[in-house]
């Protein structure tokens, strides 16, 4: 007996071939001997089966001695043995229809779990193997679960159902809802405008929800809410914003915040949360602000940084085109009695400059100029 595997909702063609390459009488029945369809001369005739409106054949193939039964919009309950009667012989085909669905929505928040459930006909014992977009394989029986979804799990999951040495492949598109970056750092000189961007790693037609940016300034004992906003069909509207600092927010995606000026009291780290409509849980992105200030007070040239810096970052003071006068893994460095010229304060990581501030030291009789 020939075995054919089908997918729920799909179309399947069950073949039946006669030895004579011409149109002759045939009919298809199910295991209960109920006629599904057949021919009467050149006409297609249908029986009283439950497949009536979903069964078809191809007249053009009859002349080649092929008499297919085509079943559209397959259901699990279409799993049966189908019998083709042609030329006084019977061909049996066992059709097994499977369905694979994601238990929840296919749009899941980062960190959530994905459960895939296999629908199968009674008496079958299939095995399932799924491959994620990042190449991770998971195996199971009726259900497969993946916990702690990551951004790289977004995309097409390919699942293979095996039964009777035959296989059928399912493709399920999973969208992991997350920000493109889990964390970002912005380095700014004191007084500069600060741009924070929070691009999403997914696109959906309609995006509705609400969000908030909480900020923990390095100098503050507790965190505070800087801004709250709503998102409606990808349009952003601010609900509430602090007076200090007075953040501005872009009206369109990606989420975009502007801090008019970087000041030491704002240096620190923030957490932007986004709660999406009809989703439990929130999206998070951490953002950090590092602020640099270079000053000369009397005979002391000082460079300071505020905010979350890694211990391996180097802070240096150097006279332009000369070797660094001072270079330390600290958040403040200074030079006493600096010579006149353009001094550079540099914050660097393994030789790569992250932030630079220039200060002009004038001969001792005049006051310093900050460009």
């Amino acid at each position: 007996k020939k075995v054919v595997l089908g997918k729920k909702g799909d179309t399947v063609e069950l073949t039946c071939t006669a030895s004579q390459k011409k149109s002759i009488q045939f009919h298809w029945k199910n295991s209960n001997q109920i006629k599904i369809l057949g021919n009467q001369g050149s006409f297609l005739t249908k029986g009283p089966s439950k497949l009536n409106d979903r069964a078809d054949s191809r007249r053009s193939l009859w002349d080649q001695g092929n008499f297919p039964l085509i079943i559209k919009n397959l259901k699990i309950e279409d799993s049966d043995t189908y019998i083709c009667e042609v030329e006084d012989q019977k061909e049996e085909v066992q059709l097994l229809v499977f369905g694979l669905t994601a238990n929840s929505d296919t749009h899941l928040l980062q960190g959530q779990s994905l459960t895939l459930t296999l629908e199968s006909p009674p008496g079958s014992s299939p095995s399932v193997q799924c491959r994620s977009p990042r190449g991770k394989n998971i195996q199971g029986g009726k259900t497969l679960s993946v916990s702690q979804l990551e951004l790289q799990d977004s995309g097409t999951w390919t699942c293979t159902v095996l039964q009777n040495q035959k296989k059928v492949e399912f493709k399920i598109d999973i969208v992991v809802l997350a920000f493109q970056k889990a964390s970002s750092i912005v380095y700014k000189k004191e007084g500069e405008q600060v741009e924070f961007s929070f691009p999403l790693a997914f696109t959906v037609e309609k995006l509705t929800g609400s969000g908030e940016l909480w900020w923990q300034a390095e100098r503050a004992s507790s965190s505070k809410s800087w801004i709250t906003f709503d998102l409606k069909n990808k349009e952003v509207s601010v609900k509430r914003v602090t007076q200090d600092p007075k953040l501005q927010m872009g009206k369109k995606l990606p989420l975009h915040l502007t801090l008019p000026q970087a000041l030491p009291q704002y240096a620190g780290s923030g957490n932007l949360t986004l709660a999406l409509e009809a989703k439990t849980g929130k999206l998070h992105q951490e953002v950090n602000l590092v602020v640099m200030r270079a000053t000369q007070l009397q005979k002391n040239l000082t460079c300071e940084v505020w905010g979350p810096t890694s211990p391996k970052l180097m802070l240096s003071l150097k006279l332009e085109n000369k070797e660094a006068k001072v270079s330390k893994r600290e958040k403040a460095v200074w030079v006493l009695n600096p010579e006149a010229g353009m001094w550079q304060c540099l914050l660097s990581d393994s030789g790569q400059v992250l932030l630079e501030s220039n200060i002009k030291v004038l001969p001792t009789w005049s006051t310093p100029v900050q460009p």
């Epitope: 089908g6 997918k7 909702g9 799909d10 179309t11 399947v12 063609e13 001369g41 050149s42 006409f43 078809d56 191809r58 007249r59 053009s60 002349d63 085509i70 079943i71 559209k72």
Partner: antibody
Framework: QVQLQQWGAGLLKPSETLSLTCAVY????????WSWIRQSPGKGLEWIGE???????NYNPSLKSRVTISVDTSKDQFSLKLSSVTAADTAVYYC?????????WGQGSLVTVSS | DIQMTQSPSSVSASVGDRVTITCRAS??????LAWYQQKPGKAPKLLIY???SFQSGVPSRFSGSGSGTDFTLTISSLQTDDFATYYC?????????FGQGTKLEIK
Amino acid sequence: QVQLQQWGAGLLKPSETLSLTCAVYGGSFSGYYWSWIRQSPGKGLEWIGEINQSGSTNYNPSLKSRVTISVDTSKDQFSLKLSSVTAADTAVYYCARVINWFDSWGQGSLVTVSS
Amino acid sequence: DIQMTQSPSSVSASVGDRVTITCRASQGISSWLAWYQQKPGKAPKLLIYDASSFQSGVPSRFSGSGSGTDFTLTISSLQTDDFATYYCQQANSFPYTFGQGTKLEIK
């Protein structure tokens, strides 16, 4: 709802090979036959041939010697190659889904053969 | 090959008119016939199959009839959206063949 999207070279020189591909989105690829049809002002609508998921083909005898239709089930795509083209092959080429009737069509690709 | 001949090749009519297009097969094709509507720059669209069955979404003013060699497509009350070219197609045997088309124009 099934959608067919097609693409390929639009301008050919005589004797070259026409090559078009059609991708099927949002519907069952199995169980159907996938056809190529062309439409020219001179000959109207002309069925070129078809293929199914298993790679079984049927061709129009008038074009059979020059036509190859192939399938890539991993991508739900099928392709048409028509060799040794002449000006008479200038037409709009459509891909379509069929059991007996062409119930879904691609957007069409204008192919011009000119020296 | 089965030849499909449509008549008339063009017809002028007004909104609200009843229009009939005929299609004749060079040999019997039972009811293995479909009708398509095509608008300029667009792909044909299936209207009627099995000679008289409606494709989903097709307005009920369209109807098909016939069997064997002679078939008709009738539009009971023309709407502005119906001005297009109509084709018949046989699915009885390879190669599938189409009629040459009937252009329905506004009078």
